[in-house]
Amino acid sequence: MRRERGRQGDSSSCERQVDRVNLKPCEQHIMQRIMGEQEQYDSYDIRSTRSSDQQQRCCDELNEMENTQRCMCEALQQIMENQCDRLQDRQMVQQFKRELMNLPQQCNFRAPQRCDLDVSGGRC
């Protein structure tokens, strides 16, 4: 369930663009970064996919947005919301946020100036 967020620029346009792209590779890439070879991600079905491929696919998907720079924050917020319930503790939430904010740099995009990743009523 998507909640309403304040965004820079045309929010409905960004929402449509974020809805169109597949954010799963980004979610999987970040979970793999954080958890690596640990058993917790067995059910996540990413052992079969090379970690570098997930990173590349993530960047490719984000690049599919017509205005990647302007809609980046919306995409990061959506990833956070999608994964919030999977994050087991406060430390993991912080690590996930740190990785999310680093995603534009990993993909060689400009980072959003401000992006509030507090979602799900403060749970994340």
């Epitope: 690596g36 070879e37 960047c59 680093n102 990993q106």
Partner: antibody, heavy 122, light 107 residues
């Protein structure tokens, strides 16, 4: 300018455990996209990747060494460590610590320590 | 695991000559290949990443090319300080591997 410095004993007895520490200066160890790594070079031979560890504790090791390798990271101290158990003369090498950058557009060891020579001998 | 084979093992050339070093990946390494230079008694240093991009401080005489399975490092005109050992390294997936190295020596 970020620098890496290896430290540890230069001589280890066969069957014992080799322990090395790398200290990171002028950078935080918990920066995303950086894997803190160990590489070794036996005398007169090429480079061999030992393993890499992320600030979260996520680690990857060379399959040929994995059963003997333990890596850890101490974020507040800006240090990461390597332990290699049951050493033999074949583990005699110069051991380097290095930073591995893992971006989509840059995947490489961009910063290296000067290396520390470890000899396994009784 | 990707195996990297470098050739030749040794390259004997004179200053001013052109050097071409080869690195073959099996299976494919995509474009995720880096080249390092190691001078005697020193740690390796990054020269080229992403197969063809020069690292900071890498002189323009060094260039990288290739993708997939075949990669080359070219030194357009050898300077005295270029006589060293060169290693390729991949990262299309873990584990990371290095090639066996090519020594560029003075003829």
């Amino acid at each position: 300018q970020l620098q890496l410095q290896e430290s540890g004993p230069g001589l280890v007895k066969p069957s014992e455990t080799l322990s090395l520490t790398c200290t990171v200066s002028d950078a935080s160890i918990d920066t995303p996209s950086y894997f803190w790594s160990w590489i070794r070079q036996p005398p007169g031979k090429g480079l061999e990747w030992i393993g890499s560890i992320y600030y979260t504790g996520n680690k990857y090791s060379n399959p040929s060494l994995k059963s003997r390798v333990t890596m850890s990271v101490d974020t507040p101290k800006r240090q990461f460590s390597l332990r290699l158990s049951s050493v033999t003369a074949a583990d005699t090498a110069v051991y380097y610590c290095a930073r591995y950058v893992d971006y989509v557009w840059l995947r490489a060891f961009d910063i290296w320590g000067q290396g520390t020579r470890v000899t396994v001998s009784s | 695991e990707i195996v990297l084979t470098q050739s030749p093992a040794t390259l004997s050339l004179s200053p001013g000559e052109r050097a071409t070093l080869s690195c073959r990946a099996s299976p494919s390494a995509g474009r995720f290949l880096a080249w390092y230079q190691q001078r005697p008694g020193q740690a390796p240093r990054l020269l080229i990443y992403d197969a063809s991009k020069r690292a900071t401080d890498t002189p323009a005489r060094f260039s990288g090319s290739g993708s997939g399975t075949d990669f080359n490092l070219t030194i357009a005109s050898l300077e005295p300080e270029d006589f060293a050992v060169y290693y390729c390294q991949h990262r299309s997936n873990w584990p990371l591997t290095f090639g066996g190295g090519t020594k560029v020596e003075i003829k």
